[in-house]
């Protein structure tokens, strides 16, 4: 069953080069 | 549940290489970044750098970029560290850590360096 | 890099008192309407354990003695009332820009 967390928005990934930036750091879709 | 398990304690002489494997379960393993986290005796946490589960790319903080390899086994949800050329310095516990909606950590690997 | 400062280094607590401890980010670690700052505990020889995720958020399992503030570059993480399960060194750490921690603070029972 998922978390209940997962349900809150923004959804994110910690994620390198992603989310138009060339560093890493957290990506998140609301 | 998600879970992160690591190899265990690796005794190395310097100039040795050592490779250890941090095997995920409880979630799909090519969603989520695997991260690397140093921790010296008695110190704090240092990021070593992450690796993309999906593609397989690398990228490594600026202190560990060199002697140091992050890989995968993605038919096994496992994540690999090696460290070429051990030096006294690299003695420490490594830490493999992902997030996957919440922070989740192995449980650490010792890498003892030692002549 | 974005640089994390706690305070204090140690800090001695009476069974049943209020613990406070400070994390002052070199930069703003907000994004998405979200603070990417979060808290550990660790014990000697075992993994950190989370607290509380973006910077106020009680992790699943953690006592609400444990909570946690701030914004933007100050953070605050409170243990209220203190118990002897408590004795551990805390970690700040953001996940904004790359990864990085606190030097830790150490609590121990005066």
């Known amino acids: 069953r998922r978390r209940r967390r997962d349900t809150h928005f923004p959804i994110c990934i910690f994620c390198c080069g992603c989310c138009h930036r060339s560093k890493c750091g957290m990506c998140c879709k609301t | 549940q998600i879970q992160l398990v690591q190899s265990g304690p690796e005794l190395k002489k310097p100039g040795e290489t050592v490779k250890i494997s941090c095997k995920a379960s409880g979630y799909t393993f090519t969603n989520y970044g695997m991260n690397w986290v140093k921790q010296a005796p008695g110190k704090g946490l240092k990021w070593m750098g992450w690796i993309n589960t999906y593609t397989g790319e690398p990228t490594y903080a600026d202190d560990f970029k060199g002697r140091f390899a992050f890989s995968l086994e993605t038919s096994a949800s496992t994540a690999y560290l090696q460290i070429n050329n051990l030096k006294n310095e690299d003695t420490a516990t490594y830490f493999c850590?992902?997030?996957?909606?919440?922070?989740?950590w192995g449980q650490g690997t010792l890498v003892t360096v030692s002549s | 890099d974005i640089v994390l400062t706690q305070s204090p280094a140690s800090l001695a607590v009476s069974l049943g008192q209020r613990a406070t401890i400070s994390c002052r980010a070199s930069e703003s670690v907000d994004s998405y309407g979200n603070s990417f700052m979060h808290w550990y505990q660790q014990k000697p020889g075992q993994p950190p354990k989370l607290l509380i995720y973006r910077a106020s958020n009680l992790e699943s399992g953690i006592p609400a003695r444990f909570s946690g503030s701030g914004s933007r570059t100050d953070f605050t993480l409170t243990i209220n009332p203190v118990e002897a399960d408590d004795v551990a060194t805390y970690y700040c750490?953001?996940?904004?820009?790359?990864?990085?921690f606190g030097q830790g603070t150490k609590v121990e029972i005066k």
């Open positions: 850590t992902t997030y996957a909606t919440s922070w989740y």
């Open positions: 750490q953001q996940s904004n820009e790359d990864l990085t």
